[in-house]
Interface confidence: low
């Protein structure tokens, strides 16, 4: 006896759904996809906005930092002397860190040609050098922990830093000297930061004076000069002192530098 099963296949669920349900499902899918795309785009926007806010905050911090240095240099006593010294040493360290020789791969070199040539970093930090010359202009050398970023700033005749690009520069000098009141003249020890622009007379940018110490044989004192100045191409800056023989040339005592802002 042969039994035959007339097995009807079940109707597909999809075809059984009413049209209103299909439209609802379609709209729901479109809504969810739109929601996902919208969320993704909003996340990207938010990320970029936060980056911009962060940049602005950093810029504000940099401005505050520069203002603090300026306050220290103008002698405003809103900060303790210790803070000022700390800030100055941090700033000098920061300048040196910027100029640390990073190993550049060929790829970075080509990038530097494209981007760096338009606005290259210009910075210099030179170290004092004892001189047999009787001139009041201090002598400097590229030695020890010095910085010379590129040929857009050069040390000329060991006495002046010369820039090839116009712009705002932070120029600083630290002069440490050892003097005694009895052995020195009555006049104080004066350090001056001077500018010589092409076709113009020399001019004093900054000046500081210290009275002589009563310590024997002499007392060490330091003068720090620093400020932001507009320099023209070919402008040179140098440091003058009343008595170069009293300047201390030990490691880290006397230095001179600039940084293009």
């Amino acid at each position: 006896m042969i039994e035959t099963y007339n097995q009807t296949s079940p109707r597909s669920a999809a075809t059984g759904l009413p049209i209103s349900m299909k439209i609802f499902m379609y709209l729901l899918t479109v809504f969810l996809i739109t929601q996902m795309i919208g969320s993704a785009l909003f996340a990207v926007y938010l990320h970029r906005r936060l980056d911009k806010i962060e940049d602005e905050r950093n810029l504000h911090e940099d401005f505050v930092f520069m203002k603090t240095i300026q306050r220290c240099n103008t002698g405003e006593r809103s900060l303790s002397l210790l803070n000022c010294e700390e800030i100055k040493s941090q700033f000098e360290g920061f300048v040196k860190d910027i100029m640390l020789n990073k190993e550049e791969t060929k790829k970075e070199n080509s990038f530097e040609m494209q981007k760096g040539d338009q606005n290259p970093q210009i910075a210099a930090h030179v170290i004092s050098e004892a001189s047999s010359k009787t001139t009041s202009v201090l002598q400097w050398a590229e030695k020890g922990y010095y910085t010379m970023s590129n040929n857009l700033v050069t040390l000329e005749n060991g006495k002046q830093l010369t820039v090839k690009r116009q712009g705002l520069y932070y120029i600083y000098a630290q002069v440490t000297f050892c003097s005694n009141r009895e052995a020195s003249s009555q006049a104080p020890f004066i350090a001056s930061l001077c500018l010589k622009s092409p076709g113009r007379f020399e001019r004093i940018l900054l000046r500081a004076a210290n009275t002589h110490s009563s310590a024997k044989p002499c007392g060490q004192q330091s003068i720090h000069l620093g400020g932001v100045f507009e320099l023209q191409p070919g402008a040179s800056v140098f440091v003058n002192v009343t008595d170069p023989s009293q300047v201390s040339h030990g490691t880290g005592f006397t230095s001179f530098g600039l940084l293009k802002l």
């Epitope: 020789n101 190993e103 550049e104 590229e142 020890g144 922990y145 970023s149 590129n150 040929n151 040390l155």
Partner: nanobody, 118 residues
């Protein structure tokens, strides 16, 4: 990759001269201070000379002052050491080195042997 390749070493009689060369690649040569360091047989490393990135300043160890001259050609990425009035005590392996700061060296060559003997 930073590479420093010395050449020009050899045997020379006392009072003679030699010129060492160092071909540099893999970094921005005209931004780096360069130097020469030597190591005599059985002795430690001795700094010989340094030249600043643009060649504006040169520095020498007292033992070689007046006899050795360091120079560089930035267009060829090459460092040189001209050695005159050589003495037996100048016998050493001479290394060309890239300076990070002052007399801190971060990359060295393989070295070239200079023998001063009669």
């Amino acid at each position: 990759e930073v590479q420093l390749l010395e050449s020009g070493g050899g045997l020379v009689q006392p009072g003679g001269s030699l010129r060492l060369s160092c071909a540099a690649s893999g970094f921005t040569f005209n931004k780096a201070s360069m130097g020469w360091v030597r190591q005599a047989p059985g002795k430690g490393l001795e700094w010989v000379s340094t030249i600043t990135p643009h060649g504006s300043s040169t520095y020498y160890a007292d033992s070689v002052k007046g006899r050795f001259t360091i120079s560089r050609d930035n267009s060829k990425n090459t460092l040189y050491l001209q050695m005159n009035s050589l003495r037996a005590e100048d016998t050493a392996v001479y290394y060309c080195a890239k300076q990070r700061w002052g007399v801190e060296f971060d990359y060295w060559g393989q070295g070239t042997l200079v023998t001063v003997s009669s």
